[in-house]
Structures are given as C-alpha cells and as structure tokens.
Interface confidence: medium
C-alpha cells in the first residue's frame, strides 16, 4: 500500500479510475479549500447505490471537471 497524507478530505486513497456513465446520477467537484488541500471528484450513483470518489487524475475525472467548469464560467 502507498502511504496517504490526509487533511480534512472526504475521499481517502486514490479513488476509482472510471464509473459507467449510465450509472452516474450526478458529479460533484470539491475544490481545494480549508477542508481539503486537493481537488475531489465525487460521483453519486443512480438508484441510491451510494457514492464513489473518482481519481481526479483519471481521464474521466478530467473530462467531468472540464465540463463543469465550462458550465459554470
């Protein structure tokens, strides 16, 4: 296991590389803040199947971040 350094983050560990698009209810992006010094991408799954932390360095996460930023700015 690699060692993980943590601040006040919700996601522990690297997160998943990808989630099936059809399973995604919504995606939330937590930007670095006083709570956590790294970006976190949290996927809420459909049918109340919980949440997943998406690895922010993954291709899917980068696409989601880009999409959200385009929508917001």
């Amino acid at each position: 296991f690699p060692m993980f350094k943590r601040g006040r983050c919700l996601c522990i560990g690297p997160g998943v590389k990808a989630v099936k698009v059809a399973d995604i209810e919504k995606a939330s992006i937590m930007y670095p803040s006083n709570n956590c010094d790294k970006i976190e991408v949290i996927i809420t799954l459909k049918e109340n199947k919980g949440q997943r932390c998406l690895n922010p360095k993954s291709k899917q996460a980068r696409l989601i971040i880009k999409k959200v930023e385009r929508k917001n700015f």
């Epitope: 996601c11 560990g13 932390c53």
Partner: antibody, heavy 122, light 108 residues
C-alpha cells in the same frame, strides 16, 4: 444523539470465523469514514481497519490483512467486520469509531462504540 | 510505519497539579496528531485533534501543542476525573494509523 453500537462478539475457537456489526445513528453515516480499533486485555489501542465513506477502498493493519474484511451498508447505517481464521492473539475488545466527512469532521476518531469482546480460545 | 513513543509510562500527581504528557513520533507527522483519554471499562474519548484543537465538549484545562515529531498534552490543573490512560495517535502517513503505547495518569 450519536450512537455506535457493536454486536456479534463472543467466544470462538481458533481458526473459526465471526462477524461483528456496528449500528450507527445520530450522524450522517454515509459521509463518514469508519474504523475498527481493538484493545487486547490490559494492552493499548491497535488500529485494525478503515473503510472510507464510499466503501470502495479498504485498508487493514498487517496483523489482520487477508483474514479480516471491513464492509459497510450505508442504507442500513451499519459497519461490519468479517473475521476469518481467528487466532488467540485476536482476543480483544473491538471498537468501531468514526472519522467523519466534511460534516462534523474533527480530525480524529470523535465517536466510539462501547466495544465488544471477542475471545479466541479452544 | 510511524512509531509513537509516549512518556512517561506512568505519571503520579495530585489533584490541582499540572500534568505534562509527551508523545514523540519516529518521523514527522506534521500536525496530524490526536490525543485520547480512556478510563477503565470505557471507550476512548477524543480530547485534542490536529495537535492543538480541543474536541467538542472538552474542558479548557486540556491543551495540546507541538508539530513534526514532538507533541505535548497539558492538563493545567488536574481534576479527580482526569486520572486515566492517555493515548496519542497519528493520521499523517497511513496505513496503518498508529497509537502510542499510552501514559497512565494516577493519583499520588
């Protein structure tokens, strides 16, 4: 108020299995990283396992790796510890503890159960 | 694995006195250190998190200090209910989360 209640402990023979449960209430369980910590009779605290809020990654102490499995059911607000191939040295009081998410995060294990005794003996 | 060493193993003091408990880490844990109090037959209770922050409901007589490898828990004026075992714990580099071996604070 916040409550963590462990169950499933007892006396078990070496090599056998046991499953502990921890029922949570009074906080947002689905946002919280949860741990199992144990304490052998007359000894100090030993961290056993961690499961983040999403239940995807799981982390274990070397002493239990490959034998114990931590899991959670966020719909039931319940944490589990499946203990297989039990050994005499696993005899301890087992505590479940919360390490919060964004809500109420306190940078440590801020809520603990009362503990449940597991005795491994022939 | 980061090893936490607590000293002294036992501290004998009287109510009203000041208690100073030490925790030393084998490598830097930044400020990611917590302190817990445990009384016989009870679960541990979080006192201090992130080296110096008092947890909810903890009296002001408890304070924490330090960063890197050296940390101190101070109880400014001991109350009868403060006699217990105290543990430090790091959450900087893990797995595993590690605890110190404990300091027993007993009545002199």
């Amino acid at each position: 108020q916040v409550q963590l209640v462990e169950s499933g402990g007892g006396v078990v023979q070496p090599g056998r299995s046991l499953r502990l449960s921890c029922a949570a209430s009074g906080f947002t369980f689905s946002n919280s990283a949860m741990h199992w910590v144990r304490q052998a009779p007359g000894k100090g605290l030993e961290w056993v396992a961690l499961i983040p809020f999403d239940g995807y990654n799981k982390y274990y102490a070397d002493s239990v790796k490959g034998r114990f499995t931590i899991s959670r059911d966020n719909s039931k607000n319940t944490l589990y510890l499946q203990m297989n191939s039990l050994r005499a040295e696993d005899t301890a009081v087992y505590y479940c503890a919360r390490e919060g998410g964004y809500t109420g995060y306190d940078g440590g294990f801020d809520y603990w159960g009362q503990g449940i005794l597991v005795t491994v003996s022939s | 694995e980061i090893v936490l060493t607590q000293s002294p193993a036992t501290l004998s003091l009287s109510p009203g006195e000041r208690a100073t408990l030490s925790c030393r880490a084998s490598q830097s844990v930044s400020s990611y250190l917590a302190w817990y109090q445990q009384k016989p037959g009870q679960a541990p209770r979080l006192l201090i998190y992130d080296a110096s922050n008092r947890a909810t409901g903890i009296p002001a007589r408890f304070s924490g200090s330090g960063s890197g490898t050296d940390f101190t828990l101070t109880i400014s004026s001991l109350e009868p209910e403060d006699f217990a075992v105290y543990y430090c714990q790091q959450r900087s580099n893990w797995p595993p989360y590690t605890f110190g071996q404990g300091t027993k604070l007993e009545i002199k």
